[in-house]
Interface confidence: low
């Protein structure tokens, strides 16, 4: 039988009446155009909706936009366009919402051709009021908030000036010219690249990396011959041109650019790229593109300093620079990542790691699924997940994989079951254990979202025809009920729920089309009456994460510790509630070789946990570049995996001796170091 049609499916009683009483329609008095939606703050219920309509005239485009505000999670909206003086808002800049619960919003307006600068509308009270401010420059990018202080804003101008405001956009000061890329670091530090000669494009590879820690009063050049830079976790990365040729290398700093080390990664040529796939304060996943237009590269995982790298995955699918990769952090379970590889026969296969890139494996075939036509053996195959690449290839995949940190273990994704990703219409699969096992959840492509920390999953069929039905499940996708939310079907455009999966409200967005006009419409459904009572202790059960063999004493040990979670029973129909916090009990494991990565100069042969010397380095002194000096490494080949918390057991010895010799890295020499003040 199809998923969800079993006899024992727990039906929610009287749900139609309960949902009908909690379904709120809002028709926007608008021609269709485009619509964008932003949540303002966390748990505030405030939503801003910007509708934009372009009227193409012979010579120019005339635009009109409207701004709406809801303070009840989208049940009711008020037209507040007059607060922004009926100005046309530039949708390419979106709505710049301030960090945390600052309540700050910046909208960038369209201005007429001859004006001296742009115009913004600013609110610091969750969009109840706006202040119009004329800018002394034309913005090139959306305003960037400092993560530490939402009054500090950063913007690049169309003239490549770097502008800073210290009073939430009231006053602006140009702190540097000829800037290509700028980013906020920690402690209100700004990093940016500048060009000396022609332009950002012409000087690529000859840029300088600068830093200011006092909002532009003084500067320090922290790098030269820069191609690009990036921030990830506590790491600052720069790709730097080599002296002798057109290759470039990654340098890394963990002290805001004061000192740099050369990452033990392959150098790349002009047509290749590096990409930080994921980073936290412990480590980084780095993709290094293969030479030639192969569409793949290698994933490396770093040590705790971002310097020594272990090869994690070969033939990792990542199309040309800025292209598509399926790399996905499964946020519902620690250590889990999913991505795609391009196999020798050019088919695309999905791989999963449960230990932060230590080992990769195929996804287990779902119990209730047959192998498709891509499988050589009809009894042996794997699940393959559709993500960004499939979406970019216009396959019938409306959504990327979904997981939420507070919906422990749940992963939802489109996929196919075979030897590789199939171009046939996919189905939707769910895992409730962080990707170890999978079940077909819904037939055919769907939009889906998680509400109430996993207590409810909502889905809408992906169809070219108008729709009026929503599906929901209160048991992690085992059983589904359908609810007709409107008599008149709408052309569906999106499903919106408050980020963080804490809400019980879902908004269905779409438009109605008649002979004369089309209008935006939203339906917000509150599921609070479906989950009538608050969950109690008896509704939760203990679950050991990463458990694969309960008989094994090491069962659940990942990165040196195991975690037991309290999880909602599938049979419990109750509210986790907005204040729900994941309850977990960690316990430390003893160390084994699995808790160590191979040190510089060592590698792990396949299917072996021991690190052995790289043949080409055998008998050589191990020397590597650290903080601009050459270091001598005495090691028996192991280094603790970043974030690994194991204790006792195996403890390989390693020692680093300073050789007091300078590295050959041309990145920064003392004479290039300079400080400047405005």
């Amino acid at each position: 039988s199809a998923p969800g049609e079993d006899e024992e499916c727990g039906r929610v009683r009287d749900f139609v009446a309960k949902l009908a009483n909690n379904t709120h329609q809002h028709v926007f008095d608008d021609l269709r155009g485009s619509v964008s939606l932003s949540w303002v703050g966390d748990s505030t219920g405030v939503i801003l909706v910007l509708t934009t309509f372009h009227v193409p005239l012979v010579i120019m485009t005339f635009g009109q936009s409207k701004l709406y505000r809801s303070e009840d999670y989208g049940k009711n909206f008020k037209d507040i366009t007059d607060l922004i003086n009926n100005t046309f808002i530039r949708t390419e800049f979106g709505m710049a919402i301030g960090p945390e619960n600052s309540g700050k919003v910046v909208l960038t307006a369209e201005v007429s051709g001859g004006s001296r600068g742009g115009r913004i509308f600013r609110s610091s009270d969750f969009a109840k009021n706006f202040v119009q401010t004329d800018l002394p420059f034309h913005p090139l990018t959306q305003m960037m908030y400092s993560p530490q202080n939402s009054d500090y804003l950063l913007a690049l101008s169309t003239e490549n000036g770097l502008w800073v405001s210290k009073n939430f956009g009231g006053k602006w000061e140009e702190i540097h010219k000829a800037v290509c890329l700028a980013k906020w670091g920690s402690d209100n530090t700004i990093f940016f690249t500048t060009y000396a000669n022609g332009s950002c494009k012409a000087d690529l590879g000859a840029l300088e990396l600068w830093r200011t820690s006092d909002l532009g009063k003084s500067f320090k050049t922290i790098g030269v011959k820069i191609y690009s830079f990036g921030l990830g976790g506590r790491f600052l990365f720069a790709s730097v041109m080599a002296d002798k040729d057109t290759t470039r290398r990654i340098h890394v700093s963990t002290d805001q650019g004061d000192t740099w080390s050369m990452a033990q990664l392959p150098s790349v040529g002009q047509e290749q790229f590096y990409s930080i796939l994921a980073a936290n304060d412990d480590m980084v996943f780095m993709h290094v593109d293969e030479p030639g237009d192969t569409g793949f590269g290698t994933i490396f995982t770093s040590d705790d300093r971002g310097i020594v790298y272990s090869k994690s995955l070969d033939r990792h699918l990542y199309t040309t620079t800025g292209g598509e990769t399926d790399f996905t952090n499964v946020t519902s379970l620690r250590g889990v990542y999913i991505t795609s590889v391009l196999s020798e026969d050019n088919s695309i296969q999905t791989m999963i790691t449960f230990d932060q890139g230590g080992r990769w494996t195929h996804l287990r075939k779902p119990e209730n699924s047959e192998c498709d036509a891509t499988a050589k053996n009809k009894n042996e195959c794997s699940l393959h997940i559709h993500a960004s690449y499939s979406i970019s290839q216009k396959l019938n995949v409306p959504m990327a994989p979904l997981s939420e940190p507070n919906a422990v273990g749940i992963v939802i994704a489109h996929g196919s079951v075979g030897d590789a990703i199939s171009v046939m219409v996919p189905d939707v699969y769910i895992s409730d254990d962080g990707g170890y096992s999978w079940t077909k959840m819904l037939e055919g492509p769907h939009y889906y979202t998680i509400l109430d920390a996993g207590g409810i999953i909502v889905a809408i069929e992906h169809s070219s025809r108008p729709i009026n039905v929503i599906k929901f499940s209160t048991d992690e996708g085992q059983c589904w009920q359908t609810y007709t939310f409107t008599r008149d079907p709408i052309y569906f455009t999106g499903l919106a729920s408050e980020p963080g999966a804490r809400s019980m409200n879902i908004s269905i967005w779409g438009f109605t089309e008649s002979f004369l006009t089309s209008q935006w419409v939203s339906y917000t459904i509150d599921f609070k009456d479906i989950l009538e009572r608050n969950c109690e202790e008896k509704d939760y059960t203990i679950w050991l994460a990463h458990s694969t063999d309960p008989e094994d004493y090491e069962d659940g040990c990942i990165l040196g510790y195991k975690e037991q979670f309290l999880r909602l029973r599938k049979s419990s129909v109750c509210q986790n509630g907005r204040d729900y916090v994941v309850t977990k009990q960690p316990s430390i494991c003893l160390c084994s070789l699995e808790d160590f990565l191979c040190d510089f100069g060592y590698y792990r042969p396949e299917n072996d946990s021991k690190c052995v010397e790289q043949p080409e380095l055998k008998g050589h002194d191990l020397e590597f570049c650290l903080y601009g000096r050459e270091e001598h490494l005495t090691t028996n080949g192991y280094r603790k995996i970043p974030g690994d918390k194991c204790q006792g057991g195996v403890n390989p010895v390693r020692e680093v001796k300073d050789l007091k010799k300078k590295c050959t890295s041309n990145f920064l020499s003392p004479e290039k170091q300079n400080s400047k003040s405005n």
């Epitope: 004493y553 090491e554 510790y561 195991k562 316990s587 430390i588 494991c589 003893l590 160390c591 084994s592 070789l593 699995e594 160590f596 946990s609 021991k610 028996n636 080949g637 192991y638 603790k640 918390k645 204790q647 006792g648 057991g649 195996v650 403890n651 390989p652 010895v653 390693r654 020692e655």
Partner: antibody, heavy 129, light 107 residues
Framework: QVQLVQSGAEVKKPGASVKVSCKAS????????MSWVRQAPGQGLEWMGI????????SYAQKFQGRVTMTRDTSTSTVYMELSSLRSEDTAVYYC??????????????????????WGQGTTVTVSS | EIVMTQSPATLSVSPGERATLSCRAS??????LAWYQQKPGQAPRLLIY???TRATGIPARFSGSGSGTEFTLTISSLQSEDFAVYYC?????????FGGGTKVEIK
């Protein structure tokens, strides 16, 4: 020979802090973890936490979390245990003990416990008003 | 955390006799268990590690056995210097935990 020498006895008032040192000699300091164990008068042994001398990473028993800090100084091969917000029930003998870590990882990926094989002589901490 | 329970709390044995001490874990600790001896006014001393391996310099009359949740320390023929308190300790999962101790006294 391998030995751990701890600092002398301390008398402290409630609410104060105490910092006990443990100097290691006779082996490579960074090759073994160090645990701290305490024993109240007439009571059993109670594990407080562990420190890895290589990176200084620590793990504390939940009971002492927020009150205990373990540090190390590799230049003097010394580990320290500081306990703050002292109460009368913290009156005990505090021991440092060289913790397992096994042999250097040459063997298979075994998870084998070698026991706390070397102990300090103990430091008596008395908390009294 | 894993709770270690030792029995009996006190064991009265005559010199030359056999003493059997028991230690039970609330969940499996595999063979990650150690036994210690402590005499009044002294620091504990490691006797057995890995549940059954004698530490350096420990006489053959001390032996350990067991795996999982049930462990035994046996002293085949008690000598006068063996009268002391004995503790078991697990290192399977942090936090490390000790049993409450068994006091072996002269009968």
């Amino acid at each position: 020979q391998v030995q751990l020498v701890q600092s002398g006895a301390e008398v402290k008032k409630p609410g104060a802090s105490v910092k006990v040192s443990c100097k290691a000699s006779g082996y490579t300091f960074t090759s073994r973890y160090m645990s701290w164990v305490r024993q109240a008068p007439g009571q059993g042994l109670e594990w407080m936490g562990i420190i890895n001398p290589v990176g200084g990473s620590t793990s504390y028993a939940q009971k002492f979390q927020g009150r205990v800090t373990m540090t190390r100084d590799t230049s003097t091969s010394t580990v320290y245990m500081e306990l703050s917000s002292l109460r009368s029930e913290d009156t005990a003998v505090y021991y440092c003990a060289r913790d397992p870590s096994g042999i250097a990882a040459a063997g298979p990926a075994s998870r084998y416990y070698y026991g706390m094989d070397v102990w300090g002589q103990g430091t008596t901490v008395t908390v009294s008003s | 955390e894993i709770v270690m329970t030792q029995s009996p709390a006190t064991l009265s044995v005559s010199p030359g006799e056999r003493a059997t001490l028991s230690c039970r874990a609330s969940q499996s600790v595999s063979s990650n268990l150690a036994w210690y001896q402590q005499k009044p006014g002294q620091a504990p001393r490691l006797l057995i590690y890995g549940a059954s391996t004698r530490a350096t310099g420990i006489p053959a009359r001390f032996s350990g056995s067991g795996s999982g949740t049930e462990f035994t320390l046996t002293i085949s023929s008690l000598q006068s210097e063996d009268f002391a308190v004995y503790y078991c300790q697990q290192a399977r999962l942090g936090p490390w935990t000790f049993g409450g101790g068994t006091k072996v006294e002269i009968k």
